[in-house]
Interface confidence: medium
């Protein structure tokens, strides 16, 4: 057993057919020694009396808010969790697999840019009684400090019969530097409790490996003379790192008709412009890498041709 | 400061070119030892990430952008540094600084030249000849190292007697390469970096 | 001991909003877990739930009649009150309030009272 | 929603005799499922929770079990007081959703 915040106390389980479960001591938080008894969940029904409540937890039957009381007036609480173990495995029942890029991806994370500012996000088709607690660090043995907000609700998607929730939360690294080559890994950990349930989640990075550029800005079509040329150009995302000639990006130009079917023409280039074909109802995106660094390319930036 | 990106113009300055064949010749190693060392640990997620040149080089310091010089966090471990009186540099000064940087640079591909040669005289002799370090990738070392145009002492390569560890050594490379792209990637950034300066 | 009793009028008239009151005793809801479920079931049929509130003012209603549903909550008079505009015909039915603990299951419930939806 | 399909509507048994009653979520719930007993002109009143935890003072003849969409009540050897509607009710997701009920009779 152990706390995870103020009397709030996770007690971690074998899950099989007839274990035997943990023997938990609930000391009651007060000077009195006498005439205490033990409720479960604001039930009227006495567990026990005395200081110290000792219980056989099994299963979440045997959870939840235990009070301890002296003549009618409530003394203290001490709620415990249950942390299932199965095979060996901690249970994972309350995050979805969001099997991208691998199988057993519960968190996803992704950067904007080298400024140590980084956002998670899961998925879980739990949409009350939940709650998320987010830590993270740079290393794990000798931690150096990283900031976490509050998890919150950004999107709910229906997948089919289901409807799922995605919650998101925005982390900054404390002391990072741009440019800094990354040795040790970010670490981000995340404490789930659904009901009387405590699940936790890990996910470990370099920040290098999740950069993830916003799409080009002002994107602008300028029609050549006598030509069915245009020249396409566009400008390094507000959110990209800087100075951009060392934080450089490479552009991919796309040119695709109105069917999806329709062939593709599509030139990179290092340069905030190019020259392009632009067909009848076709249209014109532009997504952005890191030059040098080959991680995520950003979503488009488009435009049509007319 | 959003300077244009120039095209590589080897005579405005040859190392951008070089330095950006480096890049090219160690990822695409570091891929062909991913592939063939399937079975050993070579991700980035698998491997320690340890820096042969750490203590002995100081590259992302000698080599920061002026822009990053008034981040804190960048300056922690700086001996050097390039802020002046009122952050003004004088020419004398920015020429000084970028020779830091190019001979940190010039230092650290000396150090992974002598451990990959080491490392590829143990994988000739294993009796899987299962990889094999490419040439291609010591020559574009060479090139650029030649392109800096600093003149130092050639460091003999180590010689062991020793009948070497060959699952060690593979993972060695994997370590070695996974830190020597990295150090590619800041190599690379600070060549485009002066070349737009 | 713990009892919830649910209050309001009997007969209302189409249209009309219907207001109605839990009270409860032997828990608060001023402590956390706890929370308070409003839940009906016309004449002969299963039970639907309509909208639940919690210890900290977090509210969920039954997305089907979320627009004519507002549930909310005296701490001090250990209250909570359901109200349900444009009533019609087909939402007479026993109406039930009931507490829901952290074991997230409905352990106690009022007796019900009984709306009709009639002109 | 969370649609609970619960089967049979209705039951004719003897006493003594063993009931099984069955619920099936569109979705998986977890053991987010509760069992509900309301005897004629009375409210509801919890059985099991957690799809298989017997509520204080439940008789150890009723039993649930089940995880994900699958689950099952049983009361074991039944008596003339067990004559009553029973509900399943899933509360993994809101809007939390009832089972049709299963209508007990004894003969």
């Known amino acids: 057993i152990w706390e995870l915040k103020k009397d709030v106390y996770v007690v971690e389980l074998d899950w099989y057919p007839d274990a035997p479960g943990e023997m938990v001591v609930l000391t009651c938080d007060t000077p009195e020694e006498d005439g205490i008894t033990w409720t479960l969940d604001q039930s009227s029904e006495v567990l026990g009396s005395g200081k110290t409540l000792t219980i056989q937890v099994k299963e979440f039957g045997d959870a939840g808010q235990y009070t301890c009381h002296k003549g009618g007036e409530v003394l203290s609480h001490s709620l415990l969790l249950l942390h299932k173990k199965e095979d060996g495995i901690w249970s994972t029942d309350i995050l979805k697999d969001q099997k991208e890029p691998k199988n057993k991806t519960f968190l996803r994370c992704e950067a904007k840019n080298y400024s140590g500012r980084f956002t998670c996000w899961w998925l879980t088709t739990i949409s009350t009684d939940l709650t998320f607690s987010v830590k993270s660090s740079r290393g794990s043995s000798d931690p150096q400090g990283v900031t976490c907000g509050a998890a919150t609700l950004s999107a709910e998607r229906v997948r089919g019969d289901n409807k799922e929730y995605e919650y998101s939360v925005e982390c900054q690294e404390d002391s990072a530097c741009p440019a800094a080559e990354e040795s040790l890994p970010i670490e981000v950990m995340v404490d789930a409790v659904h009901k009387l349930k405590y699940e936790n989640y890990t996910s470990s990075f370099f920040i290098r490996d999740i950069i993830k550029p916003d799409p080009p800005k002002n994107l602008q079509l300028k029609p050549l003379k006598n030509s069915r040329q245009v020249e396409v150009s566009w400008e390094y995302p507000d959110t990209w790192s800087t100075p951009h000639s060392y934080f450089s990006l490479t552009f991919c130009v796309q040119v695709q008709g109105k069917s999806k079917r329709e062939k593709k023409d599509r030139v990179f280039t290092d340069k905030t412009s190019a020259t392009v074909i632009c067909r009848k109802n076709a249209s014109i995106s532009v997504r952005a890498q890191d030059r040098y660094y080959s991680s995520s390319w950003s979503e488009w930036a488009s435009v049509p041709c007319s | 400061r959003n300077l244009p990106v120039a095209t590589p113009d080897p005579g405005m300055f040859p190392c951008l070119h070089h330095s950006q064949n480096l890049l090219r010749a160690v990822s695409n190693m570091l891929q062909k030892a991913r592939q063939t060392l399937e079975f050993y640990p070579c991700t980035s997620e698998e491997i320690d990430h340890e820096d042969i040149t750490k203590d002995k080089t100081s590259t992302v310091e000698a080599c920061l952008p002026l822009e990053l010089t008034k981040n804190e966090s960048c300056l922690n471990s700086r001996e050097t540094s390039f802020i002046t009186n009122g952050s003004c540099l004088a020419s004398r000064k920015t020429s000084f600084m970028m020779a830091l940087c190019l001979s940190s640079i010039y230092e650290d591909l000396k150090m992974y030249q002598v451990e990959f040669k080491t490392m590829n005289a143990k994988l000739l002799m294993d009796p899987k000849r299962q990889i094999f370090l490419d040439q291609n990738m010591l020559a574009v070392i060479d090139e650029l190292m030649q392109a800096l145009n600093f003149n130092s002492e050639t460091v003999p390569q180590k010689s062991s007697l020793e009948e070497p560890d060959f699952y060690k050594t593979k993972i060695k490379l994997c370590i070695l390469l996974h830190a020597f792209r990295i150090r590619a990637v800041t190599i690379d950034r600070v060549m485009s970096y002066l070349n737009a300066s | 001991e713990v009892t919830l009793r649910e209050s309001g009028p009997a007969l209302v008239k189409p249209t009309q909003t219907l207001t109605l009151t839990c009270t409860f005793s032997?828990?608060?809801?001023?402590?956390?877990?706890?929370?308070v479920s409003w839940i009906r079931q016309p004449p002969g049929k299963a039970l639907e739930w309509l909208a639940h509130?919690?210890?900290?003012?977090?509210?969920y209603y039954n997305p089907s009649l979320k627009s004519r549903l507002t549930i909310s909550k005296d701490t001090s008079k250990n209250q909570v009150v359901l109200t349900m505009t444009n009533m019609d015909p087909v939402d007479t039915a026993t109406y039930y309030c009931?507490?829901?603990?952290?074991?997230?299951?409905?352990?106690?419930w009022g007796q019900g009272t009984t709306v009709t939806v009639s002109s | 929603s969370v649609v609970m399909t619960q089967t049979p509507k209705f039951l004719l048994v003897s006493a003594g005799d063993r009931v099984t009653i069955t619920c099936k979520a569109s979705?998986?719930?977890?053991?987010?499922v509760a069992w509900y007993q309301q005897k004629p002109g009375q409210s509801p009143k919890l059985l099991i929770y957690?799809?298989?935890n017997r509520y204080t003072g439940v008789p150890d003849r009723f039993t649930g079990s089940g995880y994900g969409t699958d689950f099952t009540f049983i009361i074991s050897t039944v008596r003339a007081e067990d004559l009553a509607v029973y509900f399943c009710?899933?509360?993994?997701?809101?809007?939390?959703?009832f089972g049709g009920g299963t209508k007990l009779e004894i003969k």
């Open positions: 032997g828990f608060s809801l001023s402590k956390s877990v706890m929370g």
């Open positions: 509130i919690y210890w900290d003012d977090d509210k």
């Open positions: 979705q998986s719930v977890s053991n987010d």
């Open positions: 009931a507490r829901r603990g952290i074991r997230s299951a409905m352990d106690y």
């Open positions: 009710q899933q509360d993994y997701n809101s809007p939390w959703t």
């Open positions: 957690y799809a298989s």
